[in-house]
């Protein structure tokens, strides 16, 4: 249905408060490097233009799409050339190359100051004094450290970080009230980011007929009593509004996210007997809610597989005649059965499956050649489930800190090109999922860990894919997304690896260390271990082992010392002279 | 409630033709089987054919030619269109659904049949 | 295929022991169903994949078999249970066959 003016029907639909958010959302997306009262001039620019299309929407420029009304705005940024480099050039382009430019100079990684949390103090005297600046400020710094943030989750994100500190600078007790508040919000921030990431990656890199599968799959598992027809019709909608949000559509996106909700909550019986609650909550916290609603309990009487799929011979009939169909269903036949599996797992079995019926339906007897399909699938399903066994002894066995290290160890010595910071997010973040996920039964474990793998593995494929050094990573992150984890398992120790100069400022510390949190001192160790591979590849467990141990003594040691600086230096040096003779450097 | 409804049934002379109609509620047709069976009076049940999620439709060697199964997913319907219809067609036409898009069976929810008599 | 039901009839008490046997002209794996039938009424399913009882069936019906041979089980016939009982093979092809029934009877 076709509106005069698609700014006024947004503004219409989201009301005035979620419009703004929206815009400066977009608008520091695309721009990450501008200051916050820039974004804010453009934002009340926009809003008002929108609010005179509002009163006619045939007045002058309001027939204008959103990209060109946007784009056009981002483009009078005084500084773009100075402050962007060649994102300057998108602005002589016309649309939709111009949008697609703005998304292309994205920056996963960008180049900005790390936020430091002031006191409470200061944070509930900001807040108090301004209250909607305060929370601008929240979606423009989060916004724009992470370009792709679902941008109507984080309006919920918004909400609750608006209440937390309604709630909490009225406490007796702020710090105790709002900080760990501020810490759970933080954390999950950057997961939702994160998991975000990883479908747009999905969409962009691998097509929407990847994201549709992963979607069907998903949602099959979710809601296994939804028929076929219900849950097409619910990926459809979903695949529509995660490509509206990670091309930068965020209006429109948060308008069909809530339209989706809607039409969820007034289908519930025909889609999941776990929707009530999450139904009778407010949009934002509806939408929430039903994203990451439990899976429905599986229906009785579902008859096995291998009749319509396996054993009947009409298989390649029916295969050839509605492919897409066919696989469809297989593929929702299969999820249902199984919220035990991983989505990728699941998507595994369905390309293993198609790959077979392309080859048996060319073969002189096509069932001979399928009959045994089913068996395919075996060591497919027993490789994650005995990578996620052993991996959860070894967490249960060494905990999370170094478990941390036994997987830096292992994927710096795999690809130890990549740059130490991102080596030491990922596998930190890696290396997280055994507290995330050991702790469930065996019959949501796998689902739980190789589905959060795929999407730590997706962070170290994006921030490769900007300054790209090793060719394994690029190799097994553009292959095949679903096959991105067990790729990333098999590699071996890159044995043409040329180990890095050693450097002694690289292992020089200093008394700011012990000042520091714990999670930044074990970054900093962290770091430490990570260049100690690089310099020393063929290094042994044991021999790794005692250098950490040295050197997390040496630490504690210093920051005890009566002259910290004097016993860093000194200490130090005895250090590294150590370390080096016990790796052979 | 999900349910399926079938109609069009009723006296019909020998070679003329019928098409009979399969109303389902509750739940969507397009994501299953849609099954045709028949059964004479005092006699055993004969599978006709079925329309799959992939619209393809599937017969019992007898039934090929003079029998064809259709469905309107906007009217959430399936029908069976009889030709050149006989004395021995005479039954009681049922509806089945299958347990899945691309299934030849189990059928958990049929119809209450409809009553097709071929007589002059 | 053809599926051959036995007995065609068969004549029983309350209480008794019943077993229906059906037989698959060639192999079907394990993809048979059995259905009850009572006059006026459409076929009501009662086991699939050969052995696996339908939710809200009574416990006393059991079925076992595969490949050709197959069997219906009532442990313990209740009055309810007078009906007729068909066997469906399907799976192998885009087809389906029903067995010509098994008439059950009051003794």
């Known amino acids: 249905d076709a509106h005069k003016s698609e700014v006024a029907h947004r503004f219409k639909d989201l009301g005035e408060e979620n419009f703004k958010a929206l815009v400066l959302i977009a608008f520091a997306q695309y721009l990450q490097q501008c200051p916050f009262e820039d974004h804010v001039k453009l934002v009340n620019e926009v809003t008002e233009f929108a609010k005179t299309c509002v009163a006619d929407e045939s007045a002058e420029n309001c027939d204008k799409s959103l990209h060109t009304l946007f784009g056009d705005k981002l483009c009078t940024v005084a500084t773009l050339r100075e402050t962007y480099g060649e994102m300057a050039d998108c602005c002589a382009k016309q649309e939709p190359e111009r949008n697609e430019c703005f998304l292309q100079h994205k920056d996963d990684n960008p180049n900005l100051p790390r936020l430091v949390r002031p006191e409470v103090d200061v944070m509930c005297t900001a807040f108090h004094d301004n209250e909607e600046t305060f929370l601008k400020k929240y979606l423009y710094e989060i916004a724009r450290r992470h370009p792709y943030f679902y941008a109507p989750e984080l309006l919920f994100f918004a909400k609750r970080y608006k209440a937390a500190f309604t709630e909490c600078c009225q406490a007796a007790d702020k710090a105790a009230c709002l900080l760990p508040k501020l810490d759970e919000l933080r954390d999950e921030g950057k997961a939702s980011s994160a998991k975000q990431r990883l479908k747009c990656a999905s969409l962009q890199k691998f097509g929407e007929r990847a994201f549709k599968a992963w979607a069907v799959a998903r949602l099959s598992q979710r809601f296994p009593k939804a028929e076929f027809a219900e849950v097409s019709k619910l990926v459809t909608d979903l695949t529509k509004v995660h490509t509206e949000c990670c091309h930068g559509d965020l209006l429109e996106c948060a308008d069909d996210r809530a339209d989706l909700a809607k039409y969820i909550c007034e289908n519930q019986d025909s889609i999941s007997s776990k929707l009530k609650e999450c139904c009778e909550k407010p949009l934002l916290e509806k939408s929430h809610c039903i994203a990451e609603v439990e899976n429905d309990e599986m229906p009785a009487d579902l008859p096995s597989l291998a009749a319509d799929f396996v054993e009947s011979k009409d298989v390649c009939k029916n295969y050839a005649e509605a492919k897409d169909v066919f696989l469809g269903m297989f593929l929702y036949e299969y999820a249902r059965r199984h919220p035990d599996y991983s989505v990728v797992l699941l998507l595994r079995l369905a390309k293993t499956y198609e790959t077979t019926l392309e080859k048996c339906c060319a073969a002189a007897d096509p069932h001979e050649c399928y009959a045994k399909v089913f068996d395919e699938f075996k060591p497919l399903v027993e490789e994650p489930q005995n990578l996620i066994k052993q991996n959860c002894e070894l967490f249960e066995q060494l905990g999370e800190y170094k478990f941390q290290n036994a997987l830096l160890v292992r994927y710096t010595k795999k690809v130890p090109q990549v740059s130490t910071p991102t080596l030491v997010e990922v596998s930190r973040n890696l290396g997280k999922v055994g507290s995330k996920c050991c702790k469930h039964p065996e019959a949501k474990r796998m689902p739980c860990a190789e589905d959060y793998l795929s999407v730590v593995l997706n962070q170290l494929c994006v921030l490769h894919e900007k300054t790209p050094v090793s060719d394994r990573v690029t190799k097994c992150c553009t292959e095949s997304l679903v096959n991105r984890r067990p790729c990333f398992s098999a590699l071996e120790v890159d044995e043409t690896y040329v180990p890095k100069e050693f450097n002694a400022e690289t292992f020089t510390f200093h008394a700011d260390i012990c000042t520091l949190s714990e999670k930044e001192r074990q970054i900093k160790k962290q770091t430490a271990l990570v260049e100690l591979v690089k310099h020393k590849p063929k290094a042994t467990k044991e021999q790794l082992k005692a250098v950490m141990d040295d050197f997390a003594a040496f630490v504690e040691k210093c920051c005890k010392a009566d002259d910290k600086e004097t016993c860093f230096a000194e200490e130090g040096k005895k250090l590294v002279a150590a370390s080096q003779a016990a790796l052979g450097l | 409630e999900v349910q399926l409804v079938e109609s069009g049934g009723g006296l019909v002379q020998p070679g003329g033709s019928l098409r009979l109609s399969c109303a389902a509620s509750g739940f969507s047709l397009s994501s299953y089987a849609m099954n045709w069976v028949r059964q004479a009076p005092g006699k055993c049940l004969e599978w006709i054919g079925h329309i799959n999620a992939g619209d393809i439709a599937y017969y019992a060697t007898w039934a090929k030619g003079r029998f064809t199964i259709s469905r309107d997913n906007s009217k959430n319907t399936v029908y069976l269109q009889m030709n050149s219809l006989r004395a021995e067609d005479t039954a009681v036409y049922f509806c089945?659904?299958?347990?899945?898009?691309?299934?030849?069976?189990?059928?958990?929810?049929w119809g209450q049949g409809t009553l097709v008599t071929v007589s002059s | 295929f053809e599926l051959t039901q036995s007995p065609s009839s068969l004549s029983a008490s309350v209480g008794d022991r019943v077993t229906i046997t059906c037989q698959a002209s060639?192999?079907?794996?394990?993809?048979l169903a059995w259905y009850q039938q009572k006059p006026g009424q459409p076929p009501k399913l009662l086991i699939y994949d050969a052995s696996d009882l339908t939710s809200g069936v009574p416990s006393r019906f059991s079925g076992s078999g595969s490949g050709t041979d197959f069997t219906l089980t009532i442990s313990c016939l209740q009055p309810e249970d007078f009906a007729t009982y068909y066997c469906q093979g399907y799976g192998g092809s885009s087809t389906t066959t029903f067995g010509c029934g098994t008439k059950l009877t009051v003794l």
């Open positions: 060639e192999s079907i794996n394990s993809r």
């Open positions: 089945a659904r299958g347990a899945g898009g691309f299934s030849t069976g189990p059928f958990k929810l």
